[in-house]
Amino acid sequence: TEVKVIQPEKSVSVAAGDSTVLNCTLTSLLPVGPIRWYRGVGQSRQLIYSFTTEHFPRVTNVSDATKRSNLDFSIRISNVTPEDAGTYYCVKFQRGSPDTEIQSGGGTEVYVLAK
């Protein structure tokens, strides 16, 4: 059965300066390949977080993604600014050269409220 990427919240609101959690769960880890978070769609989408060895300021994983059975790929964005507003997608890739996108979550829109 094909892996599904579940983003349960269609939108979240967060006050500037606060942190927010964007939830994402997978129904399977197979086929093997990375999971990445993007803001926006298409060619101009911005990589927000990758569950590899890379480091991303202000963005951390919520659960212990080093668990071999982990299916929770939620992230926390800290010290949110108005520039962080947008729709965030959790995306599953199949390994390859380059990796191939096989499934995306439905997206979670982040609204940033003035403090």
Epitope: P31, V32, P34, A65, T66, K67, R68, R95
Partner: antibody, heavy 118, light 107 residues
């Protein structure tokens, strides 16, 4: 620089126990899963056990389940392998290794020799 | 089980390919580990199929397709003599495995 230094090896008798340690430095230890791998004399590499970064999840090869226990102390930047009911077949060099995001290995320790002999 | 040739040999400057078969492309990631003498610390030359650690020379590369992975050494050197172990992680079983090792001799 990433450094992994094993200790605790030595000569023990069959049936005895031993605890190996691995001291980690040069990286954020609490962010990485870790594993133990061994190499018997004249043989190849054999993965034994792995542990998640937080220490809550452990994984073992069938042949050591129930005899070996992997654990870690993140504040001490240390990884452990508790071995019991040792037999001559457990004689090997034991390596600790840091895992990549997909549970392969990117850094290895120098190893510690365990000899089980009567 | 991962299967690789017991030995390969080459002259300096030649290209060496070592294959590793037996994994499932759907569930297995591959790595290659170099061991210059028995009991010495292995060195990772390739992980995640084709990722080369920053301190590994660019003559080492890797690929994977179907049920096999390949380590390629382009312009092999005498100092590349070693045993090369293919390693795999199976996301279905959560288990790591190794091939039996390939002894590379540079003539």
């Amino acid at each position: 620089d990433v450094q992994l230094v094993e200790s605790g090896g030595g000569v023990v008798r069959p049936g005895e126990s031993l605890r190996l340690s691995c001291a980690a430095s040069g990286f954020t230890f609490s962010s990485y899963a870790m594993s133990w791998v061994r190499q018997a004399p004249g043989k190849g590499l054999e993965w034994l056990a792995g542990i998640s970064a937080g220490g809550s999840d452990t994984y073992y090869i069938d042949s050591v389940k129930g005899r070996f226990t992997i654990s870690r102390d993140n504040p001490k930047n240390s990884l452990y392998l508790q071995m019991s009911s040792l037999t001559a077949e457990d004689t090997a060099v034991y390596y600790c290794a840091r895992e990549t995001w997909n549970h392969l290995f990117d850094y290895w320790g120098l190893g510690t020799l365990v000899t089980v002999s009567s | 089980a991962l299967t690789q040739p017991a030995s390969v040999s080459a002259n300096p400057g030649e290209t060496v390919k070592i294959t590793c078969s037996g994994g499932d492309y759907y569930s297995t990631y591959y790595a290659w580990y170099q061991q210059k003498s028995p009991g010495s610390a292995p060195v990772t030359v390739i992980h995640s199929d084709d990722k080369r650690p920053s301190d590994i020379p660019s003559r080492f590369s890797g690929s994977a397709s179907g049920s096999a992975a390949t380590l390629i050494i382009t312009g092999v050197r005498v100092e590349d003599e070693a045993v090369y172990y293919c390693g795999g992680y199976d996301g279905r079983t959560y288990i790591n495995t190794f091939g039996a090792g390939t002894t590379l001799t540079v003539l």
